[in-house]
């Protein structure tokens, strides 16, 4: 049933990391167009990316209203140059997407290392609190902002003459550990959400060297 | 708990226009869209059109499109719906709902009797 | 639009009767299916949604079945307070649309 020459959208996914979310489907169109419906389990359908040849279609505006929420997409199929025609049912060919919750679901990116001191045998590493598309009283948010204490950092370290790595974890963005003096030492970091059952952990920032610019040395 | 107080009931002219309002309370009202139904003498119900108080998004009802205009006041969690032109067959019974997910109707306004009539 | 056909559009019944009303959609609406009751002069009264669920506070005498295109609410034992207007209702998809009523009336 459907529509005359339209196939259904299949294979949709979300694509989401930091809560930039975007809903992607196959097949590429041929002869079709696409509109994408997205609604809350609590809300109603809400239509987005009108009569698109795209392939996804950017929901992030709506998913950051309540990253809590659960969302359901669905993608509609219409043939390219009619999109009034309907088949004999009366009504476009769509299909549903998986359920998605953001606060649950989103990739957590990768972070960064912002910066690291280090005041005799202590070495402070600052985590760079990343912004996010999550808005509160007209200002952005940060992922921490957003999870709390839901997200803690992990931190590896090592020296650099040898490949025993360490590990700390924080539950800010925050690391002090002790470091053997004279000797210099490589950074790495992982966001991690405990309490998650998927998507856990970021993939690893990229690895920062005491001695170079990024970090600072006092000798006290 | 939740309640939907509608505003009372109206005579207009043909060819005049109604605007109906729906207070709302005992929940977060940009939370959760607002659906208005209409419902003529004796007869079956209507669905019009909804709109999310979180960002006045709407979708009409084909037959009403251009006709009706649903707004909300947030600050006094207040929904309104306005119908212009009318004729003698808008003559009905008028409902705001509150949505609980697609197309789901679990609260109820007591409604509002609009008469057209020359 | 999505049309939905109830049958029958009024029946007679007496208490303790177990009472069938059917509704068709006139395509699949993958179980967005919801019925209320409606008595004179008042709101309609959410009873059950998607399909099978019982609205809260509902007896649970009432209950609903069906896929596709065809459902089902079922009174297993009705009661006085349950004489009354019924109505489906398609939450598929905008336009939603109600079936015209089911109304039970006392044999």
């Known amino acids: 049933s459907g529509t005359t020459n339209t196939v259904a959208a299949y294979n949709l996914t979300w694509k989401s990391t930091n809560f930039k979310t975007i809903l992607e489907w196959e097949p590429k169109p041929v002869n079709q167009v696409y509109t994408v419906q997205i609604s809350t389990k609590s809300g109603d359908w809400k239509s987005k990316c009108f009569y698109t040849t795209d392939t996804e279609c950017d929901l992030t505006d709506e998913i950051v209203k309540d990253v809590k929420q659960t969302y359901l997409a669905r993608v509609f199929s219409y043939p390219a140059g009619n999109v009034e025609s309907t088949g004999s049912a009366g009504e476009p060919l769509y299909e549903n997407s998986p359920e998605f919750t953001p606060y649950l679901e989103t990739n957590l990116g990768q972070p960064t290392i912002q910066s690291f001191e280090q005041v005799g045998t202590k070495v402070n590493v600052t985590v760079e609190d990343e912004r996010t598309l999550v808005r509160r009283n007209n200002t952005f948010l940060s992922l921490r902002d957003v999870f709390g204490k839901d997200l803690i950092y992990t931190l590896y370290y090592w020296k650099s003459s040898s490949s025993g790595k360490k590990t700390a974890k924080t539950n800010t963005n925050e690391f002090l550990i002790d470091v053997d003096k004279g000797e210099n030492y490589c950074f790495s970091v992982q966001a991690v959400i405990p309490s998650r059952t998927v998507n856990r952990k970021s993939t690893d920032s990229p690895v920062e060297c005491m001695g170079q610019e990024k970090g600072e040395f006092r000798e006290i | 708990q939740v309640q939907l107080v509608q505003s009372g009931a109206e005579v207009k002219q043909p060819g005049a226009s109604v605007k109906v309002s729906c207070k709302a309370s005992?929940?977060?009202?940009?939370?959760?869209?607002m659906h208005w139904v209409r419902q003529a003498p004796g007869q079956g119900l209507e669905w019009m059109g909804m709109?999310?108080?979180?960002?006045?998004?709407?979708t009409y009802a084909q037959k009403f499109q251009g006709r009706v205009t649903l707004t909300v006041d947030t600050s006094t969690s207040t929904a309104y719906m306005e119908l212009s032109s009318l004729r003698s067959e808008d003559t009905a019974v008028y409902y705001c709902?509150?949505?609980?997910?697609?197309?789901?109707?679990?609260?109820w306004g007591q409604g509002t009797l609009v008469t057209v009539s020359s | 639009d999505i049309q939905e056909t109830q049958s029958p559009s009024s029946l007679s019944a007496s208490v303790g009767d177990r009472v069938t009303i059917t509704c068709r959609a006139s395509?699949?609406?993958?179980?967005?299916l919801n019925w209320y009751q409606q008595k004179p002069g008042k709101a309609p009264k959410l009873l059950i949604y998607?399909?099978?669920r019982l609205q809260s506070g509902v007896p649970s005498r009432f209950s609903g079945s069906g896929s596709g295109t065809d459902y089902t609410l079922t009174i297993s034992s009705l009661q006085p307070e349950d004489f009354a207007t019924y109505y489906c209702?398609?939450?598929?998809?905008?336009?939603?649309?109600f079936g015209q009523g089911t109304k039970v009336e006392i044999k």
């Open positions: 005992g929940y977060t009202f940009t939370t959760y869209w």
């Open positions: 709109i999310d108080p979180s960002d006045s998004y709407t």
């Open positions: 395509q699949d609406i993958r179980n967005y």
């Open positions: 998607h399909t099978s």
């Open positions: 709902a509150r949505g609980s997910g697609p197309g789901l109707f679990a609260y």
């Open positions: 209702q398609q939450g598929n998809m905008p336009p939603y649309t």
